[in-house]
Amino acid sequence: EVEKTACPSGKKAREIDESLIFYKKWELEACVDAALLATQMDRVNAIPFTYEQLDVLKHKLDELYPQGYPESVIQHLGYLFLKMSPEDIRKWNVTSLETLKALLEVNKGHEMSPQVATLIDRFVKGRGQLDKDTLDTLTAFYPGYLCSLSPEELSSVPPSSIWAVRPQDLDTCDPRQLDVLYPKARLAFQNMNGSEYFVKIQSFLGGAPTEDLKALSQQNVSMDLATFMKLRTDAVLPLTVAEVQKLLGPHVEGLKAEERHRPVRDWILRQRQDDLDTLGLGLQGGIPNGYLVLDLSMQEALS
């Protein structure tokens, strides 16, 4: 806490300017009017205040707005935003996308801080859902943002917002997240033609069921191996050798290099060796000729 002391004669600040960097902590506290600071917050960003001086400025705003800062002040916080705690930010009501952008800009190029995470959480909860403009903004600043959300949180993303998602935004998503996002993407892109549809849906395919993969195999999509390796194992296992060949097109040769990795390894174990041999890739580990395959999962379902 900074002690309350009278401002020395002639030192009362008439505006927020660079002369204030020469003020001691107690002088800043005594000589800068909090209301003046609030109206001239945008100037702080251009003044090289020390960390200690920033603490004093924050303290002044906290006293002026004990229930939380108004958006007019929040929008111009600049690097003072980084002195805020998550507890401070939980008091705010940020509704403007411009305010969100201004504060994200302060932390641009760095990983998401606790302050930023709290700010985004407050903003999204206030809006009720992750609309396209918000998602556009968040993924522009934090490509991994979408994958930081739980499947429950992702369920509030409307299909229309999926248009804002870029392939790199999904790089760190796990299968549970893609399970939620894939149906939304399928809905969002449903009116596109074959090749355009595949380009858009490709990065979401880690959540695709077997029947959709079978359908894609009939469309000459030439899926690359990187995409194939991210598919759900349980979705890949029922595919026939012919379907995988059609799905991958010229990329089918890449299966050899991946034969020891999932889902390729598990898929090979489910195929007849005869069928695998037709690919001419030397894939080994299939079911030997003459063996009968019993689908026990089907048997259990029937009993």
Epitope: A46, I47, P48, F49, T50, Y51, E52, Q53, L54, D55, Y79, L82, K83, S85, K108, G109, H110, S113
Partner: antibody
Framework: QVQLVESGGGVVQPGRSLRLSCAAS????????MNWVRQAPGKGLEWVAV????????YYADSVKGRFTISRDNSKNTLYLQMNSLRAEDTAVYYC????????????WGQGTLVTVSS | DIQMTQSPSTLSASVGDRVTITCRAS??????LAWYQQKPGKAPKLLIY???SLESGVPSRFSGSGSGTEFTLTISNLQPDDFATFYC?????????FGQGTKVEIK
């Protein structure tokens, strides 16, 4: 007068860890930001990381992100750099340096400690 | 991250010469630029901050100018003690980046 003294350097194998320390005196340590800057043999200066006065914000160079952690103990006037998964290219003299605010330069530097990553 | 490019990388000069080193930022950094001097085996020393402000105790023959993306360090009357490597550094973003350095050597 301001004094910064680094320690903890030495020879370490690739993949191993090392922790550097920087003991500060002559100023109010808890008021100022602290940085690590390194210099590979015969090369230029490379900024590594910064930590704000109260430890609330930490920023890293892309080359060390996820491997190095900057921290401080204001009660001991000491800055730390925890270096994990060390690589040959991390071989350098490591300097600690002070800044007084987000828009302040590095006004005081230690003399550095040499870290050699080699098998 | 903001990239800093210094030129030249080496500069040969004589005592009494006027020497100019330039530094270019990959994006605007306003005036948040510092210049440092480093001698072999020693820590860097701050010379100039905020593009043109002289650090206390630094001789007045050192001066800096520029803003935005283009900056210069000038040594007006090179002294024997000035032969060293000089670095620019931006501190506009929390990732503070250095230029690659300019070595000023005796001609």
């Amino acid at each position: 007068q301001v004094q910064l003294v680094e320690s903890g350097g030495g020879v370490v194998q690739p993949g191993r860890s090392l922790r550097l320390s920087c003991a500060a005196s002559g100023f109010t340590f808890s008021s100022d930001g602290m940085n690590w800057v390194r210099q590979a043999p015969g090369k230029g200066l490379e900024w590594v990381a910064v930590i704000w006065n109260d430890g609330s914000n930490k920023y890293y160079a892309d080359s060390v992100k996820g491997r190095f952690t900057i921290s401080r103990d204001n009660s001991k006037n000491t800055l730390y750099l925890q270096m994990n998964s060390l690589r040959a290219e991390d071989t350098a003299v490591y300097y600690c340096a002070r800044d007084r605010g987000p828009l302040w330069p590095l006004d005081y530097w230690g003399q550095g400690t040499l870290v050699t990553v080699s098998s | 991250d903001i990239q800093m490019t210094q030129s030249p990388s080496t500069l040969s000069a004589s005592v009494g010469d006027r020497v100019t080193i330039t530094c270019r930022a990959s994006q605007s950094i306003s005036r948040w630029l510092a210049w440092y001097q480093q001698k072999p085996g020693k820590a860097p020393k701050l010379l100039i901050y905020k593009a043109s402000s002289l650090e206390s105790g630094v001789p007045s023959r050192f001066s800096g100018s520029g803003s935005g993306t283009e900056f210069t360090l000038t040594i007006s009357n090179l002294q024997p003690d000035d032969f060293a490597t000089f670095y620019c550094q931006q501190y506009n973003s929390y990732s503070r980046t250095f230029g690659q350095g300019t070595k000023v050597e005796i001609k």
